[in-house]
């Protein structure tokens, strides 16, 4: 089993490259992964106590 | 439903091996990296390793590196964790856990998602 | 490797206390900080990715913020169930490092 791609830059993570839509690029790893949508709720209506909280849809299983 | 299953854990003299197993269900290996942690007695929590199944690309925490290591076997389904040399210091319940990831322009944003139930390795004569 | 340095290392708490965890990371890890929660003899949870995204499932009382260096998880009205111990990791460059970790105590 190869090694992770480290020569170059040893532990840093090269700038992301182009990812297939169902896909994004994790820098932790350095490669094109499965990747869920991220969302931000609309705002609560006015005079709600705190902003609703960030959250997103889940990845496909 | 998503699990994590580790077994293999148990008993080893110092220099001894021991091979753990990461059983998945209810997602594919094959879509997100897959880590290993440990936390020793008492202690926080220490990343060991991590592997991508689709690339083959894996990366070890300093202090097991040349000595753990990290494979999968996608038509199982499951990710191992073969340890040698062992070391008193590398007592620890052993976690495995999948990485989740969601695309925030184009790049993951993303934590752990879920952990297995944990395995116990003692290394002690 | 990034240091991630929690603090404080310990704290006394009592229901419905507003809570703040802080963690400091040794270089710029923009916002790639998630946090975890965890109880005795039990995994760590997912509470936060991405320094200020709520995990499914969590309670809105958590929430995160911060960028760069500097992160904080705030508990807005501790609840019985949040004893624990809280950690900060960053995954923004491997090896992905965690705080020290945080207990929550009941006071």
């Known amino acids: 089993m190869r090694r992770g791609p480290r020569s170059l830059r040893g532990r840093d993570a090269p700038a992301p490259t182009p990812c297939v839509p169902a896909e994004c690029f994790d820098l932790l790893v350095r490669h094109c992964v499965a990747c869920g949508l991220l969302r931000t709720p609309r705002p609560k209506p006015a005079g709600a106590s705190s902003p609703a909280p960030r959250t997103a849809l889940q990845p496909q299983e | 439903e998503v699990q994590l299953v580790e077994s293999g854990g148990g008993l080893v003299q110092p220099g001894g091996s021991l091979r753990l197993s990461c059983a998945a269900s209810g997602f594919s290996i094959s879509s997100n990296s897959i880590h290993w942690v440990r936390q020793a007695p008492g202690k926080g929590l220490e990343w060991v390793a991590w592997i991508t199944p689709t690339h083959g690309s894996t990366d070890y925490a300093d202090s097991v590196k040349g000595r753990f290591t990290i494979s999968a076997d996608t038509s199982k389904n499951t990710a191992y964790l073969q340890m040698n040399s062992l070391r008193a210091e590398d007592t620890a319940v052993y976690y495995c856990a999948r990485r989740v990831c969601y695309n925030r322009l184009g790049v993951c944003a993303g934590g752990m998602d879920y952990w297995g139930q944990g395995t116990l390795v003692t290394v002690s004569s | 490797d990034i240091q991630m340095t929690q603090s404080p290392s310990s704290l006394s708490a009592s229901v419905g206390d507003r809570v703040t965890i802080t963690c400091r990371a040794s270089q710029d890890v923009s916002t790639a900080v998630a946090w975890y929660q965890q109880k005795p003899g039990k995994a760590p949870k997912l509470l936060i990715y991405?320094?200020?995204f709520l995990y499914s499932g969590v309670p809105s009382r958590f929430s995160g913020s911060g960028s760069g260096t500097d992160f904080t998880l705030t508990i807005s009205s501790l609840q019985p169930e949040d004893f624990a111990t809280y950690y900060c990791q960053q995954s923004r460059i491997t090896p992905p490092t965690f705080g020290q970790g945080t207990k929550v105590e009941i006071k």
């Open positions: 991405s320094a200020s």
